[in-house]
């Protein structure tokens, strides 16, 4: 690296600075940035992030486990969307399970776990985040086929379950591929006196290019692709529903608008911050104030983005009438089972089997319905 050839003398006013032209490399930073203390930002995230992550973890686990349990009890007539929802709930559960580690990391201000844990957790975190986003894309496509392409729908969705399982496998595989760089670059290392679990690009020849590439992939698969599909699919779904003479169409439109708005509200701020970060990577004249602002914004918008996995069960599952009915039945039956064990005189066995059989007969008619969630 000695004697880098890149010369910044052309940037200087030649009449007075010719004698101090500096071989400033592409990775140089404005001197002020090294004096700019982001201590107050770190103090804020030390307090805010662990609380926020803990809440997201609790509610995310609760909501998504309930979705999984409901699917486990719901034996018949699983549509493609139902399979996607189940996978999304699993992805969200795995995702929120990594949050306590990050909460501890933020609270202590250092990575206190091993290098292997660092790689593993960053990997799980990335895989499940990407997987969740790609599954949202699949759900919007499935709803598009079911509602807009209603005439072709029976032909397109005749082999529903096998196809959706294959699609889910592809989604998980794609998520692993997208996230593979996370395993490679993320590592535990000491920087500025404390251990961190961060991507380390110093091993590659073009660190900033790699950083931009990784950010680009995150933005593409974690935001732009799902957004494009959602806008396309839901625009046509709303058009179709507006034209349809159906009493339930307004509720369906409201659900769709809620889904899109929540996605945008949660994802746009964080992805805008990522875009600004990417745009700033090569810049030297960043001000201390703007760095602090980006620091605060990044912390808050990241929490907002993660909040999405708590809202997924509400938006995609609990909002649906059928899903709520099944879920309430399961709760009643579980309560019933508990009561049965408590008082031997009281029997619920008949009611339990009756409920389950009624469930299956009710849904058998709608075997090819889009999903019991909408």
């Amino acid at each position: 690296m000695s004697g880098e050839s890149m010369n910044f003398s052309d940037v200087f006013d030649s009449s007075e600075d010719y004698f101090v032209s500096v071989n400033t490399s592409y990775y140089s930073v404005d001197s002020e940035m090294l004096l700019c203390s982001l201590q107050e930002v770190r103090q804020f995230s030390r307090l805010f992030v662990p609380i926020a992550y803990s809440l997201i973890c609790v509610f995310g686990l609760l909501g998504n486990i309930l979705v999984v349990i409901t699917f486990a009890f719901y034996k018949k007539a699983r549509s493609m969307t139902d399979v996607y929802l189940l996978n999304m709930a699993i992805a969200d559960i795995l995702f929120v399970l990594t949050l306590p580690f990050w909460a501890v990391s933020h609270a202590t201000g250092a990575w206190v776990f091993s290098n292997a844990t660092c790689k593993l957790l960053k990997g799980i975190y990335a895989i499940n985040f990407n997987c969740g986003m790609l599954l949202l894309t699949c759900i919007s496509m499935d709803r598009y086929i079911a509602i807009v392409q209603a005439t072709k729908s029976f032909r397109l969705r005749s082999r529903t379950l096998p196809r959706s399982k294959i699609i889910c496998l592809v989604v998980w595989g794609l998520s692993v591929i997208i996230s593979s760089s996370t395993f490679v670059f993320n590592q535990k290392y000491n920087t500025q006196g404390s251990d961190v679990c961060e991507p380390k690009y110093q091993t590659v020849s073009e660190p900033i290019r790699w950083k931009l590439l990784m950010l680009g992939l995150e933005l593409l698969f974690g935001f732009f692709i799902p957004l494009m599909f959602m806008i396309f699919c839901y625009t046509f779904i709303v058009k179709t529903l507006v034209q349809a003479q159906n009493s339930k169409r307004h509720k369906a439109i409201r659900v769709i608008i809620a889904v899109v708005l929540v996605f945008l509200a949660c994802q746009i701020p964080h992805n805008m911050v990522l875009l600004v970060t990417a745009a700033n990577l090569g810049k030297m004249n960043r001000s201390c104030q703007s760095e602090k602002l980006i620091g605060y914004t990044k912390t808050v918008t990241e929490v907002l983005a993660f909040l999405h996995c708590c809202l997924n069960p509400v938006l995609y599952a609990f909002i649906g009438q059928k899903f709520r009915n099944y879920f309430l039945k399961i709760l009643k039956d579980l309560w019933c089972v508990r009561r049965k064990y408590k008082s031997s005189g009281f029997s619920c066995a008949g009611r339990y089997s009756e409920n389950i059989s009624r469930q299956t007969s009710e849904t058998a008619d709608n075997d090819n319905a889009s999903s019991f969630t909408m």
Partner: antibody, heavy 117, light 112 residues
Framework: QDQLQQSGVALARPGASVKLSCKAS????????LGWVKQRPGQGLEWIGE????????YYNEKVKGKVRLTADKSSNSVYMEFRSLTSEDSAVYFC???????????WGQGTTLTVS | DVVMTHSPLSLPVSLGDQASISCRSS???????????LHWYLQKPGQSPKLLIY???NRLSGVPDRFSGSGSGTDFTLKISRVEAEDLGVYFC?????????FGGGTKLEIK
């Protein structure tokens, strides 16, 4: 021409105040940070602080906070370091230096000798 | 504050010899952004310091290629392949990874 022109020798009594100046070229003044470094006879260098005239931001070594104030005058492209409550410990050569990137000082003034007695 | 320690404090050399100056920091100088902000200066008697090398190993324009810098983390070295008379003076290492910026006490390069 010299890019950083510092004021000459400064003499002051203990407890008094003194203001050292450093004149930069317009380009340096508008584009970079200007720092002050202290050197006592036969000793090493000590960073006092830096001022960024374009934003007006100042950064100080905690050791001198309250003792030193850095200011900039846009009309004369000059930066100043003002001392208050001088003691014999403040006797030293003070260098003004340009800090463009990465926190290094690539060009230094000739130094101002401050004597407190 | 980060303490920068030089060794040796004085280095007597013959002209044409190789000289090696070591600098050790009390904390790692690897910044969170991946760069290491360690710089070398030379101060000749009665003069202001002059920057030789910035960010461990990058020579300033006009600095002869007999000067080279290396190291990482907390251990850094400045090498002069063939010492010339104009190289004599006090060499300082400095770090800007941490606030405040700090300098080493210096190594005096002198004729044997």
């Amino acid at each position: 021409q010299d890019q950083l022109q510092q004021s000459g020798v400064a003499l002051a009594r203990p407890g008094a105040s003194v203001k050292l100046s450093c004149k930069a070229s317009e380009y340096t003044f508008k584009s970079f940070g200007l720092g002050w470094v202290k050197q006592r006879p036969g000793q090493g260098l000590e960073w006092i602080g830096e001022i960024y005239p374009r934003s007006g931001n100042t950064y100080y070594n905690e050791k001198v906070k309250g003792k030193v104030r850095l200011t900039a005058d846009k009309s004369s492209n000059s930066v100043y370091m003002e001392f208050r409550s001088l003691t014999s410990e403040d006797s030293a050569v003070y260098f003004c230096a340009r800090s463009p990137y990465d926190g290094y000082f690539d060009y230094w003034g000739q130094g101002t000798t401050l004597t407190v007695s | 504050d980060v303490v920068m320690t030089h060794s040796p404090l004085s280095l007597p050399v013959s002209l044409g010899d190789q000289a090696s100056i070591s600098c050790r920091s009390s904390q790692s100088l690897l910044h969170i952004n991946g760069n290491t902000y360690l710089h070398w200066y030379l101060q000749k008697p009665g003069q202001s310091p002059k920057l030789l090398i910035y960010r461990v190993s990058n020579r300033l324009s006009g600095v002869p290629d007999r000067f080279s810098g290396s190291g990482s983390g907390t251990d850094f070295t400045l090498k002069i392949s063939r010492v010339e008379a104009e190289d004599l003076g006090v060499y300082f290492c400095s770090q800007s990874t941490h606030v405040p910026r700090t300098f080493g006490g210096g190594t005096k390069l002198e004729i044997k």
